[in-house]
Interface confidence: low
């Protein structure tokens, strides 16, 4: 064979990724690989991920002789072991006056009365626990409820008989029911007074209120 066809193991170097070639015989060589590479020609990047430090669902991303952890949103740090304070990152995490409480791997909301849900955005249905008298209509409010009474019933829970049903107020007086006790209240027209607006007024006082 001609001299131009002589095989020189390290010319050119078969070692890749920065590996250094060393001739070990007439037709043999050895590659000294840089950290992070392996194989007869340093062609393989060693996978640093099988035994890594990424925790709490962190995903390992292999590098050259190193790795990085890609952490889920609620964790941070080199190995995803540090809790993210969502309450600092999201000042409005809790709605409707709820208080944010940071927890390992997440956060929770402590809701004010009348609100519920993960972010306190759900108005609690107070009617579910209300004791409006059957036949009345419950109206849900924030942290409270009110009862709409059918005709003939009165009181906060519509549990009282409406004293105005018997028309106790005379002479065109207005009859209202006291929501606490169900008793009637007469608002007398000009010139009349008394619990039932049956008495004449000597002086010119108008709109007397009488409770009974």
């Amino acid at each position: 064979a001609g001299s131009d066809s002589l095989y020189v193991p390290c010319a050119p170097s078969p070692c890749v990724n920065g590996g250094t070639c060393r001739q070990t015989g007439d037709f043999t060589f050895e590659c000294n690989c840089l950290p992070g590479f392996e194989g007869s020609t340093c062609e393989r990047n060693i996978d640093d991920c099988p035994n890594h430090r990424c925790q709490n669902g962190g995903v390992c991303v292999d590098g050259v002789n190193t790795y990085n952890c890609r952490c889920p949103p609620q964790w941070t740090g080199q190995f995803c072991t540090e809790d993210v304070d969502e309450c600092l990152l999201q000042p409005n995490a809790c709605q409707n006056g709820g208080t944010c409480a940071n927890r390992n791997g997440g956060y929770g909301c402590v809701c004010v009365n009348g609100w519920s849900g993960d972010d306190c955005s759900e108005n609690i249905d107070d009617c579910a626990f209300a004791s409006c008298t059957p036949g009345s209509t419950c109206i849900d409010r924030v942290a409270s409820f009110s009862c709409m009474c059918p005709e003939g019933k009165a009181g906060l829970l519509c549990h009282l008989d409406d004293a105005c049903i018997s028309n106790p107020c005379h002479k065109g007086a207005l009859c209202d029911t006291n929501p606490l006790n169900g008793q009637y209240i007469c608002t007398c027209p000009q010139g009349y007074k008394g619990a039932d607006c049956t008495e004449d007024v000597d002086e010119g006082n108008s709109h007397h209120h009488h409770h009974h």
Epitope: D48, N51, Q55, N65, Q78, T81
Partner: antibody
Framework: EVQLVQSGAEVKKPGASVKVSCKAS????????IHWVRQAPGQGPEWTGY????????KFNEKFKGRATSTVDTSSTTAYMELSRLRSDDTVVYYC??????????WGQGTLVTVSS | DIVMTQSPDSLAVSLGERATINCRSS???????????LHWYQQKPGQPPKLLIY???NRFSGVPDRFSGSGSGTDFTLTISSLQAEDVAVYYC?????????FGGGTKVEIK
């Protein structure tokens, strides 16, 4: 309260093996790497290796590869490290330590291993 | 491996005076995630090391505020602003940016 409690002192002959235990409590065992750090008398600490309790995956300092192994028993939240083919320069205190902040946040009290013929 | 060089080897400081310990790494400790994993430990005789400062300057829980850390890249400092009797110990720096984690040789702090 996070606690790491290690097994007691050991005296071994050269060529023998030693197995040190580290019982963890006060936190979610599978969430944190357990490291092994050794310290020769009058010297600075030296990181030996770690184990990930959730997967059993281990990684060791090149210096101890082939001689050191680590295992966990998740039911008892205990980590173990075994070092074989002991030599006189393996006369050190072995510590277990919990990972956190990319550091070693909580430590066991240490286990003295004496290698002597 | 990354070599961590501490200076001085020992330090004698009067009670109430400032103590400063230096730590230099053989290459930058800035991790690709942007953090610098340089930590400081205190060790008293017969006890395990105790974490004082993590990631350059963050005091670990229960550590008095007379301990502070600073630095960047390859040069870092632990400062005890007013030395107390209970601060007599050996102090170590640790890097965990690069595999394997490596400690400094230690600085012994004594009372003058």
């Amino acid at each position: 309260e996070v606690q790491l409690v290690q097994s007691g002192a050991e005296v071994k002959k050269p060529g023998a093996s030693v197995k040190v235990s580290c019982k963890a409590s006060g936190y979610t065992f599978s969430n944190y790497v357990i490291h092994w750090v050794r310290q020769a008398p009058g010297q600075g600490p030296e990181w030996t290796g770690y184990i990930i309790p959730g997967s059993g995956g281990t990684k060791f300092n090149e210096k101890f590869k082939g001689r050191a192994t680590s295992t966990v028993d998740t039911s008892s939240t205990t980590a173990y490290m075994e070092l074989s083919r002991l030599r006189s320069d393996d006369t050190v205190v072995y510590y277990c330590a919990r990972d956190g902040a990319g550091s070693f946040t909580y430590w066991g009290q240490g286990t003295l291993v004496t290698v002597s013929s | 491996d990354i070599v961590m060089t501490q200076s001085p080897d020992s330090l004698a400081v009067s009670l109430g005076e400032r103590a400063t310990i230096n730590c230099r790494s053989s290459q930058s400790l800035v991790h690709s995630d942007g953090n610098t994993y340089l930590h400081w430990y205190q060790q008293k005789p017969g006890q395990p090391p105790k974490l004082l400062i993590y990631r350059i300057s963050n005091r670990f829980s229960g550590v008095p505020d007379r301990f502070s850390g600073s630095g960047s890249g390859t040069d870092f400092t632990l400062t005890i602003s007013s030395l107390q009797a209970e601060d007599v110990a050996v102090y170590y720096c640790l890097q965990s940016t690069h595999f394997p984690d490596t400690f400094g040789g230690g600085t012994k702090v004594e009372i003058k």
